[in-house]
């Protein structure tokens, strides 16, 4: 007996061939001997089976001695033995229909679990193997679970169902809802405008929810909510914003916040949370602000940074086109009695400059000018 595997919702073609390459009489029946379809001359006749409105054949193939039974929109319960009667012969085909579904939404938050459930006909004992978009293989029986979904799990999961040495492949598109970056850091000179961007790692037709940015300033003892907002069909509207700082927010995605001025008292870290409609849990993105200030007071030239810096970052003070006068893994450096000229304060990571502030030191009888 020939075995054919089908996928729920798909179309399957069961073949039946006669030795004579011409249109002769044929009938397809199910295991209960109920007629599904057949022919009378060049016309198609249908029986009283449950498949009536989903069964088809192709008359153009009859003249070639091929009498297919085409079943559209397959259901698990279509799994059966189908018998083709042609030329006093009986051809039996066993059809097994499988379905594979994500038993939750296919749009899942980062860190959530994905469960795939296999629907199979009674009496079958299939095995399933799924491959994630990042190449991770998982195996199982009727259910497969993946905990702690990551951003790289977004995309097409390819699952192979094996039964009777035959296989059928399912493709399931999974969208992991997350921000593109888990964390970002912005380096700014004092007084500069600060732009925070929170791009999403997914696109959906309609996006509705609400969000908030909590900020922990380095100088503050506790965190405070800087802004709350709503998201409706990808349109952003601010609900509440603090007076200091007075953040501005873009009306369209990606989520975009503007801080008018980078000041030492704002340096620190923030956590933007986004709660999406009909989803349990929230999306998070951490954002950090490092602020630099270079000042000259009397005979002391000082460079300071505020905010979450890594201990391996180097802070230097140097006169333009000269070697660094001072270079330390500290958050403040200074030079006493600096020479006149354009001084540079540099925050760097392994030689790569992250932030630079210039200050002009005038001869001692003048006051300093900050460009």
């Amino acid at each position: 007996k020939k075995v054919v595997l089908g996928k729920k919702g798909d179309t399957v073609e069961l073949t039946c061939t006669a030795s004579q390459k011409k249109s002769i009489q044929f009938h397809w029946k199910n295991s209960n001997q109920i007629k599904i379809l057949g022919n009378q001359g060049s016309f198609l006749t249908k029986g009283p089976s449950k498949l009536n409105d989903r069964a088809d054949s192709r008359r153009s193939l009859w003249d070639q001695g091929n009498f297919p039974l085409i079943i559209k929109n397959l259901k698990i319960e279509d799994s059966d033995t189908y018998i083709c009667e042609v030329e006093d012969q009986k051809e039996e085909v066993q059809l097994l229909v499988f379905g594979l579904t994500a038993n939750s939404d296919t749009h899942l938050l980062q860190g959530q679990s994905l469960t795939l459930t296999l629907e199979s006909p009674p009496g079958s004992s299939p095995s399933v193997q799924c491959r994630s978009p990042r190449g991770k293989n998982i195996q199982g029986g009727k259910t497969l679970s993946v905990s702690q979904l990551e951003l790289q799990d977004s995309g097409t999961w390819t699952c192979t169902v094996l039964q009777n040495q035959k296989k059928v492949e399912f493709k399931i598109d999974i969208v992991v809802l997350a921000f593109q970056k888990a964390s970002s850091i912005v380096y700014k000179k004092e007084g500069e405008q600060v732009e925070f961007s929170f791009p999403l790692a997914f696109t959906v037709e309609k996006l509705t929810g609400s969000g908030e940015l909590w900020w922990q300033a380095e100088r503050a003892s506790s965190s405070k909510s800087w802004i709350t907002f709503d998201l409706k069909n990808k349109e952003v509207s601010v609900k509440r914003v603090t007076q200091d700082p007075k953040l501005q927010m873009g009306k369209k995605l990606p989520l975009h916040l503007t801080l008018p001025q980078a000041l030492p008292q704002y340096a620190g870290s923030g956590n933007l949370t986004l709660a999406l409609e009909a989803k349990t849990g929230k999306l998070h993105q951490e954002v950090n602000l490092v602020v630099m200030r270079a000042t000259q007071l009397q005979k002391n030239l000082t460079c300071e940074v505020w905010g979450p810096t890594s201990p391996k970052l180097m802070l230097s003070l140097k006169l333009e086109n000269k070697e660094a006068k001072v270079s330390k893994r500290e958050k403040a450096v200074w030079v006493l009695n600096p020479e006149a000229g354009m001084w540079q304060c540099l925050l760097s990571d392994s030689g790569q400059v992250l932030l630079e502030s210039n200050i002009k030191v005038l001869p001692t009888w003048s006051t300093p000018v900050q460009p």
Epitope: K46, A55, R58, R59
Partner: antibody, heavy 122, light 107 residues
Amino acid sequence: QVQLVQSGAEVKKPGASVKVSCKASGGTFSSYAISWVRQAPGQGLEWMGTIDPNSGGTMFAQKFQGRVTMTRDTSTSTVYMELSSLRSEDTAVYYCARDSAEWELGGSFDYWGQGTLVTVSS
Amino acid sequence: DIQMTQSPSSLSASVGDRVTITCRASESISTYLNWYQQKPGKAPKLLIYKASNLESGVPSRFSGSGSGTDFTLTISSLQPEDFATYYCQQTDSTFITFGQGTKVEIK
């Protein structure tokens, strides 16, 4: 002379159902399959489904499955097509058409009803 | 389902012209193809069945040809009453499909 006479025009609200009838005369009613074909304003022909008046067996285009019902009343030689969950896109002229081949599903329609305009509007 | 594509979607011709309309199937349908004529406000009328057979009562100026995927409806000498929309229809599959139609207009 074979004739297919359809029920009159209907105006329906979105979400409602409509039932159109098609009465056959001048031929052996149960010998010929009846199909329903619709035509939206300014658009082409779209096959909806077919009923075998002899067995009552039906088949439908995938697009309409779950929303369309076709029945027959052999005592009055009438077939019915009911379309549920109506939306504005269902505004069309609905035709019944008889298969030219006796006892079979040949798909060549030699006799047609005059058409029934169904308007779906809120 | 089998897709049917007609060309052109419309054409302008004069009385006496020879007019050709083509229909292409997305897969081979042998000769399981019909042609219909429809005039505004009227039900369609069967002209040709099984690709080349003229329905009774249809004038002989109408002819059909083709097999497999490519089919043609020809009107040898266009008459005033032939200005209408023409549709092809496949019946190879029991899930019938029509072409989008070709409108024949007066030049």
